[in-house]
Interface confidence: medium
């Protein structure tokens, strides 16, 4: 808590400018009007304040807005955002995507902090669902964002938002998450032609059921081994040798390199040796 002291004569701030960097903490507290600070927040980031000075500015805003900052202030917080606690952020009502982008930019290149997680949570809850623009923004800043959501949270993602998802956004998703995302992707891409559909759906196939894999095997898709290895074991097991051969196409040779790993290992054990022999790869059931 900064002690209340009178502002020295002639030091009352008329605007937020670089002269304030020479103010001691108590002078900032005494000489900067909170309302002036709120209206000129966009200037704060251009001024090289110390962390201690930023603490004072935050304190002034907290006094002015005890119920939480208005969005006009939040949008221009800049580096002052890093001083906010999750408790501070829970008081906010952030509705503008521009505000979200501005604050994510401040944290760019760092792991998702508790502050950022709280901000995103407040924003998404305020919108009611993860729309395409929001998902676009969040995955641009945090490629792993989608996979950080629970299956329950993912269920609120509308199929239209799936268009924003890039393959790398799904790298850390587990099978339960892909189980939720795959039907949405299937719906989102349903009107695409065969080859384009496969390119888009490929990253989501870890949630595909057996019948969809069987259907893909009839379409000459040449699935690569990395994608095949991410398929659900229970979805792969019922596939016949002929179906796997058609599904993988030229990549079928890769089964030999992966024969000790799931789901290939488990699938091999389910096949008749005579059928495996037809692959010509020397796989042993």
């Amino acid at each position: 808590e900064v002690e209340k002291t009178a502002c020295p004569s002639g030091k009352k701030a008329r605007e937020i400018d670089e002269s304030l960097i020479f103010y001691k903490k108590w002078e900032l507290e005494a000489c900067v009007d909170a309302a002036l600070l709120a209206t000129q927040m966009d200037r704060v980031n251009a001024i090289p304040f110390t962390y201690e000075q930023l603490d004072v500015l935050k304190h002034k805003l907290d006094e002015l807005y005890p119920q939480g900052y208005p969005e006009s202030v939040i949008q221009h917080l800049g580096y002052l955002f890093l001083k906010m606690s999750p408790e501070d952020i829970r008081k906010w009502n952030v509705t503008s995507l521009e505000t979200l982008k501005a604050l994510l930019e401040v944290n760019k290149g760092h792991e998702m902090s508790p502050q950022v997680a709280t901000l995103i949570d407040r924003f998404v809850k305020g919108r009611g669902q993860l729309d395409k623009d929001t998902l676009d923004t969040l995955t641009a800043f945090y490629p792993g964002y989608l996979c950080s959501l629970s299956p329950e949270e993912l269920s609120s993602v509308p199929p239209s938002s799936i268009w924003a998802v890039r393959p790398q956004d799904l790298d850390t998703c587990d099978p339960r998450q892909l189980d939720v995302l795959y039907p949405k992707a299937r719906l989102a891409f349903q009107n695409m032609n065969g080859s384009e559909y496969f390119v888009k759906i490929q990253s989501f196939l870890g949630g595909a059921p057996t019948e969809d894999l069987k259907a893909l095997s009839q379409q000459n898709v040449s699935m690569d081994l990395a994608t095949f290895m991410k398929l659900r074991t229970d979805a792969v097991l019922p596939l016949t040798v002929a179906e796997v051969q058609k599904l993988l196409g030229p990549h079928v040779e890769g089964l030999k390199a992966e024969e000790r790993h799931r789901p290939v290992r488990d699938w091999i054990l389910r096949q008749r040796q005579d059928d495996l022999d037809t692959l010509g790869l020397g796989l042993q059931g």
């Epitope: 990253s203 040449s222 990549h251 040779e253 890769g254 030999k256």
Partner: antibody, heavy 115, light 110 residues
């Protein structure tokens, strides 16, 4: 020991034809894919064509589609590349390579297309 | 068609240096990515397949990794015999099977 030996390269005029051979030993090409990859003088690698005899798969790079044909004679354990309508830009060392990750390569054979 | 953009095109390094070469795919790409070493007048040699699997007989100082559409070859401690040209290569999945090579990176002695 796995070995691949290319032959059939040489000097040919634009519009002419040439057939390259890739004799394999140490494995059965019937059960493996075979690729042709070329390298123009001082340039990088360019994939040309692929065959997987067991499944009768053949694939080609757009730059050679309709002019080159890849084939295999499994009784001779040899893959071939029939090159027709040759152009100056086809001048390169042609390598054959084996398998899923191109794990074995031949020493290469030089094809020069010039008048 | 998918392009594999390899960088840098050349680099100078000393024995013992850590060297990193990157290939960026122009679009969503499978992990069927391999790395090769080629010395003048010789055929390429396989180093890494499936993005990160070390080929048998290849020294453990070579490693491969993937992050999204970026694929990286790392030589942890450069040896005299490692001065060569390195290529990345991708085998596409999808309807049109094709193989694409990066432009190559020449690793020279500083």
């Amino acid at each position: 020991e796995v070995q691949l030996v290319e032959s059939g390269g040489g000097l040919v005029q634009p519009g002419g034809s040439l057939r390259l051979s890739c004799a394999a030993s140490g494995f059965n090409i019937y059960y493996s894919s075979m690729h042709w990859v070329r390298q123009a003088p001082g340039k990088g690698l360019e994939w040309v064509a692929y065959i997987y005899p067991y499944y009768s798969y053949t694939y080609y790079a757009d730059s050679v589609k309709g002019r080159f044909t890849i084939s295999a004679d499994t009784s001779k354990n040899t893959a071939y590349l029939q090159m027709n309508s040759l152009r100056a830009e086809d001048t390169a060392v042609y390598y054959c390579a084996r398998g899923y990750a191109l794990d074995y390569w031949g020493q290469g054979t030089l094809v020069t297309v010039s008048s | 068609d998918i392009q594999m953009t390899q960088s840098p095109s050349s680099l100078s390094a000393s024995v013992g240096d850590r060297v990193t070469i990157t290939c960026r795919a122009s679009q969503s790409v499978s992990s069927a990515v391999a790395w090769y070493q080629q010395k003048p007048g010789k055929a390429p040699k396989l180093l890494i397949y499936s993005a990160s699997s070390l080929y048998s007989g290849v020294p453990s100082r070579f490693s491969g990794s993937r992050s999204g559409t970026d694929f990286t070859l790392t030589i942890s401690s450069l040896q005299p015999e490692d001065f060569a040209t390195y290529y990345c290569q991708q085998a596409s999945s999808g309807y049109h099977y094709l193989i694409t090579f990066g432009q190559g990176t020449k690793v020279e002695i500083k």
